[in-house]
């Protein structure tokens, strides 16, 4: 679809005569008839196959024709066509004299013709005007012409329809040849595909409008290049979606089981050394002068009664000091200058000579001890409390303060962690030194068999076209991560538009 445009510029008829040579009275009131038709080697009368147009009276005898002439005429003259421009044409321009106001062919005498010109040739579609001048014995006509495409038609022969659009069926303008030119941010054959945010992961991200990056299931982050770990993953990371790879010191399905209580909680006080001994379990090795499960209790060094033979103990900042009774010396008053003759044994102890009387030994009655039977028996010195229990002197008796998990007079009884049936879903409970262990039936896992083991939804290889399968442990379902070029819940469908326009 296009328009043949004819611009009349000047008509010269100096003598004001008709084609017959007869003069016009009072002058030649001139109008034009134009016939556009298919190419003919010899232009002959007949149907104006490409169209016709007439002008009103444009002037008398000789005149210049203004652009867009007034009086209802148009200059350039428009000859629209609704077909592919063939590139060739024939053109007939007739100048007529109008004696009255009726310009219809049947209202004019045949001898009202002033002049007739006929041309033919090739004409390509384009914006440039071709200037021409035709001269006869009595008249001269100067004009120019061109062929341009109608709105929304493009190409060498105006056959290509293209309408710019900016909606969900395309975002483009039209190039001179009728091809589409995508608006910024759009791509694809119909400029219907948005260009995602720069760096948006090719497989894990997509977009619905330009400069956007929407993440596929299992991925997150501005560029959709960070995997989403398993729901509930506490101290873990992932390299593919729904994983939970535990950080150092953590264990369990959700990495929420503390395997490094020492580092994470620092329970041991006063510079004690901490040792991990299982999940949420630890042992503190106290520095000298401290005691308690967490070495939180400060010991007096005299509490261990280090001074012998009745020596008295004095606490000092850097330890202790023994004040020895007469006849004894040494750091702990352990050396004697006495013999049995000096009756060194107290509390009814009997004396026995040693080394030919150089020194002696006291045999103490029950409840007394010490090299001179000078001390009442400390019931805690024999460490009677088992399993790390703390011995406490209570006058004539003693008492064991047991560590968690132990009971009995001497902390000799292990409290059964299994007594309260901690294993879920029919798990079997085993008592251990530092707690308990559950042996889980098929289909369950976790410290207490509380976790239903996920069925591996990916085991049946449900994803097509080399897609990656991920098991969503929270729903026992799978997610297919499609390679580029495939879509669908199983990546079973290739992406692809029909290959070309149907023009």
């Amino acid at each position: 679809s296009g328009v043949f445009q004819l611009q009349l510029q000047e008509f010269i008829n100096e003598r004001g005569v008709l084609a017959s040579g007869r003069p016009c009275e009072p002058g030649c009131r001139t109008f034009f008839r134009v016939c556009l038709k298919h190419f003919q080697a010899v232009v002959s009368p007949g149907p104006c196959t490409f169209g016709t147009v007439s002008t009103p009276v444009l002037g008398t005898n000789s005149f210049a024709v203004r652009d867009d002439s007034s009086g209802g005429g148009r200059n350039p003259l428009q000859l629209p066509f609704n077909f592919t421009w063939p590139g060739t044409f024939s053109l007939i321009i007739e100048a007529w004299h109008a004696p009255g106001d009726d310009l219809r062919p049947e209202a004019l005498p045949p001898d009202a013709l002033i002049s007739k010109i006929a041309i033919q040739g090739s004409l390509a579609v384009g914006q440039n005007w071709l200037l021409d001048e035709q001269t006869s014995t009595l008249t001269r006509l100067r004009y120019s012409y061109r062929v341009i495409c109608s709105d929304n038609y493009y190409g060498d022969n105006c056959s290509r329809l293209c309408k710019k659009r900016n909606d969900h069926f395309g975002h483009y303008v039209c190039q001179p040849d009728g091809n589409l030119s995508c608006l910024p941010g759009w791509t694809g054959e119909y400029c219907q595909q948005p260009i995602c945010l720069s760096g948006c992961h090719e497989q894990n991200g997509y977009c619905s409008k330009p400069a956007e990056c929407l993440c596929r299931p299992g991925w997150q982050g501005r560029l959709c290049n960070e995997c989403i770990p398993h729901n509930g993953c506490r101290h873990g990371t992932c390299s593919t979606p729904w994983q939970c790879t535990c950080d150092e010191g953590w264990g369990g399905l959700f990495c929420d089981q503390d395997l490094n209580y020492c580092t994470h909680h620092s329970p041991c006080k006063n510079g004690a050394t901490c040792s991990n001994s299982g999940q949420r379990s630890y042992t503190c090795t106290c520095r000298p002068g401290y005691t308690g499960v967490d070495c939180e209790l400060e010991l007096s060094e005299c509490d261990s009664n280090p001074c012998r033979n009745g020596g008295s103990c004095k606490d000092q900042e850097d330890g202790y000091h023994c004040l020895c009774p007469p006849g004894y010396y040494g750091l702990h008053c352990e050396h004697s200058t006495l013999s049995c003759a000096d009756s060194p044994c107290f509390n009814g102890g009997s004396c026995r000579e040693r080394n030919q009387g150089a020194n002696y030994a006291c045999e103490c009655p029950p409840n007394f001890t010490g090299s001179n039977c000078e001390k009442k028996v400390d019931r805690c010195t024999s460490n009677p409390c088992a399993n790390g229990g703390q011995c406490l002197n209570r006058g004539p008796s003693r008492m064991c303060r047991c560590r968690p998990g132990f009971t009995g007079t001497y902390c000799e009884l292990h409290v059964s962690d299994c007594a309260r049936n901690p294993c879920a879903h029919g798990g079997t409970c085993h008592d251990l030194e530092n707690g308990l262990m559950c042996t889980c039936p098929a289909g369950f896992s976790g410290r207490r068999c509380e976790v239903r083991t996920s069925i591996d939804a990916c085991a049946s290889s449900p994803c097509f076209n080399r897609a990656t399968c991920y098991t969503d442990l929270s729903t026992d379902t799978f997610v297919c991560n499609c390679p580029y070029g495939f879509v669908g819940s199983r990546c079973e469908f290739p992406v692809g538009l029909p290959p070309s326009f149907p023009w």
């Epitope: 909606d167 119909y190 692809g496």
Partner: antibody, heavy 121, light 104 residues
């Protein structure tokens, strides 16, 4: 050849939500180059475009219905759905689902057979 | 909102040409589709992108679009062409249908 089939209740009470599903067979709803639309026709009247959706979930709605309409897609079931809330008697119509093709400039080349939904108490 | 106006009805004798118009502001700058709907049936696409025919649509159906008016022409109209005809265009992201023309 692709075929479309609407399904859903034929009677809905005023103020309730109209829900319809269109099942696509003979082709994938995830094919690029197609939008999946809903059009309705009140008895004895003309066609009215409701909205459409792309397989990625992009939706476009008629502004006159926008605050009441939701269109969604389920690629795993090869279906797309229409929900129209707060219905009145004026929403009584035959509801069609259709495939709009990019290469046809948005022309709808395949239609379902339509389902009549009556809004009445 | 954008509106497309069609004459309510057009009468034509068998074998003659029927022309159905569809008017809208600057409609020539938009692509127009035409649908045929027979009683009790779903619409059928007969013209897309102003003047193109889908496969299976007879050559007697043709379309044009310029200025503010699109036209569907049925040459050599047959009895089977008796139906309602709707024009449709896209105004931005919104589909718009004409009011429909009954051809008898």
């Amino acid at each position: 050849e692709v075929q479309l089939q609407e399904s859903g209740p034929g009677l809905v009470k005023p103020s309730e939500t109209l829900s319809l599903t269109c099942t696509v067979s003979g082709g994938s709803i995830s094919s690029s180059g197609y939008y999946w639309g809903w059009i309705r026709q009140p008895p004895g009247k003309g066609l009215e475009w409701i909205g459409d959706i792309y397989y990625t979930g992009n939706t476009y709605y008629n502004p006159s219905l926008k605050n009441r309409v939701t269109i969604s897609v389920d690629t795993s079931k090869n279906q797309f759905s229409l929900k129209l809330s707060s219905v009145t008697a004026a929403d009584t119509a035959v509801y069609y689902c259709a495939r709009e093709e990019v290469i046809l400039g948005g022309g709808a080349d395949q239609w379902g057979q339509g389902t009549l939904v009556t809004v009445s108490s | 909102s954008y509106e497309l106006t069609q004459p309510p009805s057009v009468s034509v004798s068998p074998g003659q040409t029927a022309s159905i118009t569809c008017s809208g502001e600057s409609l020539g700058d938009k692509y127009v589709s035409w649908y045929q709907q027979k009683p009790g049936q779903s619409p059928v696409l007969v013209i897309y992108e102003d003047s193109k025919r889908p496969s299976g649509i007879p050559e007697r159906f043709s379309g044009s679009n310029s200025g503010d008016t699109a036209t569907l022409t049925i040459s050599g109209t047959q009895a089977m062409d008796e139906a309602d005809y709707y024009c449709q265009a896209w105004d931005g992201e919104t589909g718009v249908f004409g009011s429909g023309t009954k051809v008898t």
